[in-house]
Every structure is written in C-alpha cells, then in structure tokens.
C-alpha cells in the first residue's frame, strides 16, 4: 500500500504570530517504520535549508539559526521514551512562533520510511500582516484646482491593502505606498481628490479597504469639509406685493462654511425704504410703498469671502387675487 504525505498547499500566518504547518503520513500501515522526519526550506541559502528534524531516539533538532530552535517546535511528534516504546512520528506538524517576513517561502516535510523509502510534501507559508486603517477629511478651501479633500490610510499591511472610494461626486484617487515600520509591511495612502466647492461640503464619502486578513472589507465613512464663501439666495417674495401690504418678509438663505459673520441688505437703486428693517438674515417690511419697486440685494460675508443675491420686487396697486398664495416670509 502506497503512503503519501498530507500537507496544505498554502498556510497563512500573521506577522509576529504563531502558525502551524500540518504534515501527516497517511495511511497508517502496519510495519511501516518512520526512521526520520525532516523539514527543509528548498529555496533558502544552503546553510539555512535544513530547518528541523525529528529522530525517533534523539527527538527534535533545529540546526538553522533561522528560524532557530527558540521559534520552532514539533506539535505532536514524540520520541521514544525508553527502549520499549516506539516514537510517534506520523504527525510531523511544525509550529513556527514569532513569524517574520523572512519565514515566508516553501517548506518541505519529508518522511524517511522503511521499506517505502522517502516521501515528501511541500507547503507554501505566506506571512500576512493585518493593516490598521484610518480615514479623515482634510479641511480645504474652495479653489479651481483639484485638491485632496480626504485621506484613507491602511498602515503596515502585508500584502499591501487595496483602497477604493465610494462616492457620487466627481473625484479621482491618488495612491502612494511606503514601507511600514515593521519590516516587510506596506502603508498605503489613498488621497480622495476633487475640485473643492460648496457642493462637496458635508458630503459623506466612504473609504473601502480590502485585505485578505479581513473577513469583509472595512468601510470607513468620511464627511468632507470644504471652506467656501457664502452661496446666497433670497426667499419670501411671492409676486403679490401691493401698496400697503404689512406682512411681507424677505429671507437671505445661505449655505457657507464657516458660518456667516455678517449680512448686509441694500438696493440697486441706492435708496432703501424706511419701512424695511434689516434683522440679520431677514428683511422685515412694515408697510409696502412705491419705493419697494426696486431690486433688493443681500450680501453675506464669512471668513472665506462674500456672496450675494438679488431679488426684483414688483409692487402692485392692488392685491393679485388670481391664485396668489399666502404671503412669503
């Protein structure tokens, strides 16, 4: 009956952690004697190829300084405890502690048997490092040039993490990779770039980080912050301002970042009706007269700049009763 070595084609271990490289001789055959078990690294330099051996009488040996005896152990293999007990070598699973990047590579588990001869199996050990992720908005001021408005950083991953963005905005990503402080790891930085305008302020975009150490992608929401001058509009005019009307109000509606620091009401004609009283963002009209046949201007200031809006007012002689709505304001 033929025997075979059962190994995993690939084993993944966490950088700094412990990994087991399973190796079993199957099936159990009466009279099949395992005289030696060895683990080798065929791709390593000659003086580092022999990693571990298990001799039925002498037990385990770990000759190579890399990984070295302090980081290696046989999980189940047992040497003969006396002259009358057999060694148990069918399970040659090797544990590797304190994984380093240099541990990555091919490992050959070999059973020297009698009478079947030598049989072996090979495992590829991959050393991975789970990255630490963070994302943050960059405080930017509106401009005509593409600017980084958010950063997503995946620190010290192995292999490098894959970063993408989820957003309905018109954007592009710029990625950089640098070596992590832990040898063999990579820090990936993705810059979410767009032409910063008020439309982007307060919008939430999502950084998506994918890595084989994650069960599912990491999704990190980021709320953008764009400083921009006030964007102004005027509401409250209902096309039914008539002489003597007393309940009219204009509101200066503003989107801005940061908050407005001042409101200024004026007219294009240069004359300002005395019955119109500015109260911050509102213009309260006590009584509409003919001077209201003008264009009102609301100018709003913030730390970035200023914005303005105009509203043309047409004063009627009498109320418009044909479907006119309630008064604005």
């Amino acid at each position: 009956q033929d025997v075979r070595v059962q190994v995993l084609p690939e084993v993944r271990g966490q950088l700094g952690g412990t990994v087991e490289l399973p190796c079993h001789l199957l099936p159990p055959v009466p009279g099949l004697y395992i005289s030696l078990v060895t683990w080798q690294r065929p791709d390593a330099p000659a003086n580092h190829q022999n990693v571990a051996a298990f001799h039925p009488k002498m037990g385990p040996s770990f000759p190579s300084p890399k990984p070295g005896s302090e980081r290696l152990s046989f999980v189940s293999a047992k040497q003969s405890t006396g002259q009358d007990t057999e060694a148990e070598l069918q399970d040659a699973t090797l544990a590797l502690h304190g994984l380093t990047v240099e541990d990555e590579g091919n490992y050959t588990c070999e059973f020297a048997t009698f009478p079947k001869g030598s049989v072996r199996g090979m495992t590829w050990l991959r050393v991975i490092a789970k990255p630490k992720n963070q994302a943050e908005a960059q405080k930017v001021t509106f401009s005509q040039d593409p600017t980084t408005v958010a950063l997503c950083i995946s620190k010290e991953g192995r292999p490098p993490a894959r970063i993408s963005w989820l957003s309905s905005l018109d954007w592009e990503a710029k990625e950089t990779q640098v070596s992590g402080t832990l040898a063999g790891t990579v820090t990936v930085t993705s810059r979410f770039t767009l032409v910063p305008s008020g439309r982007a302020d307060g919008v939430t975009v999502t950084c998506k980080v994918e890595h084989e150490s994650f069960e599912e992608p990491a999704l990190i929401p980021v709320t953008l912050s764009v400083r921009y001058p006030p964007e102004v509009s005027i509401s409250g005019y209902d096309d039914n301002w008539y002489l003597g009307r007393t309940d009219a109000t204009l509101s200066c509606d503003v989107r801005s970042n940061p908050e407005p620091t001042g409101y200024d009401w004026s007219t294009t004609s240069g004359t300002f009706p005395t019955s119109a009283v500015a109260q911050g963002s509102q213009l309260v009209i006590h009584a509409v007269d003919s001077l209201f046949n003008t264009t009102f201007v609301c100018t709003v200031t913030n730390a970035v700049g200023m914005g303005r809006a105009e509203q043309v007012i047409f004063v009627r002689e009498t109320p418009n009763t044909a479907g006119a709505g309630a008064t604005g304001g």
């Epitope: 030696l36 080798q40 009488k57 001869g117 030598s118």
Partner: antibody
C-alpha cells in the same frame, strides 16, 4: 538496554547454506524491523534485507532475494538470516542491526567463512 | 539501485588537520544520508544523520553538509581517536546502499 546478540562464527563449504541468529532484548521485539548488513573483509557495508517481527513481513535487496531468507520468531525474540548457495565472495562479517532513525543498535557480528 | 561513490578510499593526515570525505549519489537522495564511523573489530556508529544533523554524543568537530547528490563529512581538527573507517549511506530509496568506505590514517 537494547541488546542484539548474534550466533557464533561459521565456516562453510561453497554451495552450502548458513543460518545466523540474532537474539534481541530491551525493547518490544515486534515493533521494529531487524536488518541484516554484511561486510566482506577490508570492504564496505552491504544491506541484505530486513524482517518485521510484528507480521513477519520481509524486505530484500534484489541482489540477495533468490538466496537469502530472513525470518523472526517472536516467542524467543530472535531473528534469523539464512543464505544459501554460498560462494567464496559471501565470506564476510554479518551484522543484525535495529533501525532507530539510523542503524543505531548492532549485534557484535558473525563471521562467515566460505572455503573449500 | 543508488550507487554511493565515496572518495578518497584512503586518507592520511596529521593530528589537528582539517579533513574531508565526500560521497556522491548516482541520483538525488535529498538529505537522506547518514555517516558512520567504524573502528577495527567494531560495528559502525552513527556520526551524522539527515546529511547535517550531528548525532548525540558526537564531538562538534564532525560536521556534515550537502544535499541532492553531493555530500561531505568534515573533521575540523583531527584527533588520534578518529583513526577509523568512514561510510556514507543513503536511506532515500530501498534498498539502502553504502559508500565503499574511506580509511583514515594518522600520520
């Protein structure tokens, strides 16, 4: 302590047979193969074959398969190697040996001289 | 069968010398090679197993190296008690085969 004690020296005529014994002690006899290796005077070592006392399975070097018979008697913990049709080039020291990783335990050797 | 060709057949050296014995396999045997030392009138004793692993109690002046088809036993500083014959043996494939031996003489 593991011990392998072999039978005494033999002088044989060409064409005859010789049977060498190897009495084992100090371990479970049925759990380990007993191998036979020979060494002609001033020459190297040559593996003849082995027996597994647990099920009497045997395994031979093809060179000796037609002439060698290796057996084991569990009741006495003794292994035997019989070589037939002896010729002068079979003159050698014959060792029984126990494989524990390597050939770790050896009998003291039995000198077989084939001479007319 | 795998042929193990050992050289030299005789080696004469002085105490303190560094000496090497080589063994060439006729086909790849991995690291499945043992080195034995045999003193006159005694059975062989294991020095090195799996090509480079020193057996228990063997002085560290004995080292083994090699893999595949080429193997070397080195004695870093020859001692008088090293007067013996040395054999390599492959256990990769049945039947086990031995080198023809290297007789080490002390000058």
């Amino acid at each position: 302590e593991v011990q392998l004690v072999q039978s005494g020296a033999e002088v044989k005529k060409p064409g005859s047979s010789v049977k060498v014994s190897c009495k084992a002690s100090g371990y479970i006899f049925t759990s380990y193969w007993i191998h036979w290796v020979r060494q002609p005077p001033g020459k190297g070592l040559e593996w003849i074959g082995a027996v597994y006392p647990g099920n009497s399975d045997s395994n031979y070097n093809q060179k000796f398969k037609a002439r060698a018979t290796i057996t084991a008697v569990t009741s006495t913990s003794t292994a035997y190697m019989e070589l037939s049709s002896l010729r002068s080039e079979d003159t050698a020291v014959y060792y029984c040996t126990k494989l524990v990783g390597t050939f770790d335990y050896w009998g003291q050797g039995t000198t077989v001289t084939v001479s007319s | 069968d795998i042929v193990m060709t050992q050289s030299p057949s005789t080696l004469s050296a002085s105490v303190g010398d560094r000496v090497s014995v080589t063994c060439k396999a006729s086909q790849n045997v991995g690291i499945n090679v043992v080195w034995y030392q045999q003193k006159p009138g005694q059975p062989p004793k294991t020095l090195i197993y799996s090509a480079s692993y020193r057996y228990s109690g063997v002085p560290d002046r004995f080292t083994g190296s090699g893999s595949g088809t080429d193997f070397t036993l080195t004695i870093s500083s020859l001692q008088a008690e090293d007067l013996a014959e040395y054999f390599c043996q492959q256990y990769n494939t049945n039947p086990f085969t031995f080198g023809q031996g290297t007789k080490l003489e002390i000058k």
